[in-house]
Structure formats: structure tokens, C-alpha cells
């Protein structure tokens, strides 16, 4: 189920690459975030908490990523026109309950100015 377009700036361009921002509520403690290109899983990151509140971060499909208390950023490099597509953040929330999944996304437009050496 697609819950809709991201209501924030999802794509941030840097030097021929793009940072894709996937947000989640800061109350969420354990989750899986997947970055989808069309229907294909490009990246994922899972945050879990063990005994003693030890945090574990795992990736089955690894991309350069950055985790904050309310977002996961995935970084794609060496942009070319083939990167233009719909990208979705697929968030599965495990804790706190209830278990829920939400999908938000947007279209990544690639312009010539973003392909190389442009700092936005």
C-alpha cells in the first residue's frame, strides 16, 4: 500500500550524487527501512535493541547510509540519467507496537546540472 508522497524534501543533491532522506517518527525504537527504486530493493537498514538497550544496526543490502533519531539517509553516487525513477522509503515499525508498514516516495528527476560537480 502506498501511503503517498513524502511531505518533505526527499532528495538532496551533492557533487554528482544524491542523498535520499527517509523519515520516521522519533518515538520509533526498532524498525527496518528499505529504499526501493520502482519495485526493486536498493538498500535496507534495520535498527534493533537488545538487552541493556544495546543498539544493533544491520543491512542486508548495503548502501552508504546515515542514521539519526528520526531519519535514515541513503546516498547514491555517480548519478546518470538511469537513476531517474520513483524512489520509495518502505518503513516497517516493530517497536513500539503495533507492527505497521508505511510507504512514501517521490520521483527523482535528473538534470544535467546534477550529474557532475554541482554542490546544491
Amino acid at each position: 500500500e502506498i501511503n503517498g508522497s513524502a511531505n518533505y524534501e526527499m532528495f538532496i543533491f551533492h557533487n554528482g550524487g544524491v542523498q535520499i532522506l527517509c523519515k520516521y517518527p522519533d518515538i520509533v525504537q526498532q524498525f527496518k527501512m528499505q529504499l526501493l527504486k520502482g519495485g526493486q530493493i536498493l538498500c535496507d537498514l534495520t535498527k534493533t535493541k537488545g538487552s541493556g538497550n544495546t543498539v544493533s544496526i544491520k543491512s542486508l543490502k548495503f548502501c552508504h547510509s546515515q542514521l539519526s533519531n528520526n531519519s535514515v539517509s541513503f546516498f547514491l553516487y555517480n548519478l546518470d540519467h538511469s537513476h531517474a525513477n520513483y524512489y520509495f522509503c518502505n518503513l516497517s515499525i516493530f517497536d513500539p507496537p503495533p507492527f505497521k508498514v508505511t510507504l512514501t516516495g517521490g520521483y527523482l528527476h535528473i538534470y544535467e546540472s546534477q550529474l557532475c560537480c554541482q554542490l546544491k
Epitope: E1, P96, P98, K100
Partner: antibody, heavy 122, light 106 residues
Framework: QVQLVESGGGLVKPGGSLRLSCEAS????????MSWIRQAPGKGLEWVSY????????YYADSVKGRFTISRDNAKNSLYLQMNSLRVEDTAVYYC???????????????WGQGTMVTVSS | DIQMTQSPSTLSASVGDRVTITCRAS??????LAWYQQKPGKAPKLLIY???SLESGVPSRFSGSGSGTEFTLTISSLQPDDFATYYC????????FGQGTKVEIK
Amino acid sequence: QVQLVESGGGLVKPGGSLRLSCEASGFTFSDYYMSWIRQAPGKGLEWVSYISSSGSAIYYADSVKGRFTISRDNAKNSLYLQMNSLRVEDTAVYYCARDEDYHGSGSPRDIWGQGTMVTVSS
Amino acid sequence: DIQMTQSPSTLSASVGDRVTITCRASQSISSWLAWYQQKPGKAPKLLIYKASSLESGVPSRFSGSGSGTEFTLTISSLQPDDFATYYCQQYLSYWTFGQGTKVEIK
């Protein structure tokens, strides 16, 4: 049709125990997370306990933690609530309800049972 | 814990009226909000989930809106069958219900 039927309610003295059952039919029970919710006479709704589709994840409201135990038997399409050390304030109608499916795509609490009354009184 | 506050507690209305019930969360719950209808002696019935999605089989006169902390349930034209108590419920973090709004005949 899709339905939930609770049983096991009744009158019990403070400190006593009861076991509530909820029998599911009309859907694949093992695909769904389930909850118990209660409603004291003339009052609002209060979530009590929640169990994942496999039974591996279980949560309780603070008001019942350590006294109530939720469980399920997917082979019997049944949900249970074992209630120990009952208090007067546990008096309520207890509902079982179907929560989301294991894909997380279901709507919340879309099917409820008719409820079973638990009265705790000396 | 996330607290849910509903207003008004009681609402007197007539058949055909447009009715609005408000629910406020103590912190942002995004769109993780459901609305239920309950009649005396009966179990609650799901009307709306994810703040604005209409549950299958629920009449289109019911609608939900809002996100973050402010939500509304609207009945566009009140019908005799709609006199009941309505509850909001957040499900971002565990579950909390509002205290209920009783819609009664004016």
C-alpha cells in the same frame, strides 16, 4: 463470516483468577496480530494486551503487567487471556479484536468480538 | 504515553446535520489514527483508519482528516443510525483512546 466469539467471563472475588477465550472463524487466524481491550461500566476503552501473529511478541498495559498473560493457539484459532490477582478495578467487558496482518498492511482493530463481562467483587 | 483528547464530550444534533468531532494528540502521531463508533451494549466498529481511510462497508458520509496532532471526524449528513458514541484511537505508540463523544438526538 469473519467473527470473534469470547467466553469465560463471570463473577470472581478479588485476588481470584479467570481465563478468557476468544474463538476466531472466517479468516486465517495465524496471519493476524490480536488484542484484548476492556471497557469498565459506563467508561471508555482501554487496551489490555497484544500478541503477534506467531506469538513471539507480547505486550501488556502497565495496569495488568505481571498479573495477566496473553497467549494463542493458532491450530485451534483461539486467543486467551489468563487473569490472575484480579482487582475490583479490573471489572469490565473484555473484547478480543483482530489487529493488522503480518504484512503490516491491515487496518487496525477491524473485527471485534461481542465481549465477555468480568465482575470482580467480594 | 500519548494522550488523546476528544471534544466535545456530548453533541446534540438532528438528522441531516453536519457533525464534526475533534481529537487532539499530546504529540505528533503522523496519520496513525482510527475512529470507532460504539452503540450501547455493542462492540466498537471501525470507521476510519490512517486518519482518513474509510473502512470497507462504512457509508461515505463518514470522513476523517488531519495529521500530526489535530484530527477530525465528520458526518456530512447525520442519519438516525449514527446516534452513538465515537472514539478516536492513536496507534503510533501502543494504543490510546480518546474519552469518547456521545452524539445524541437534539
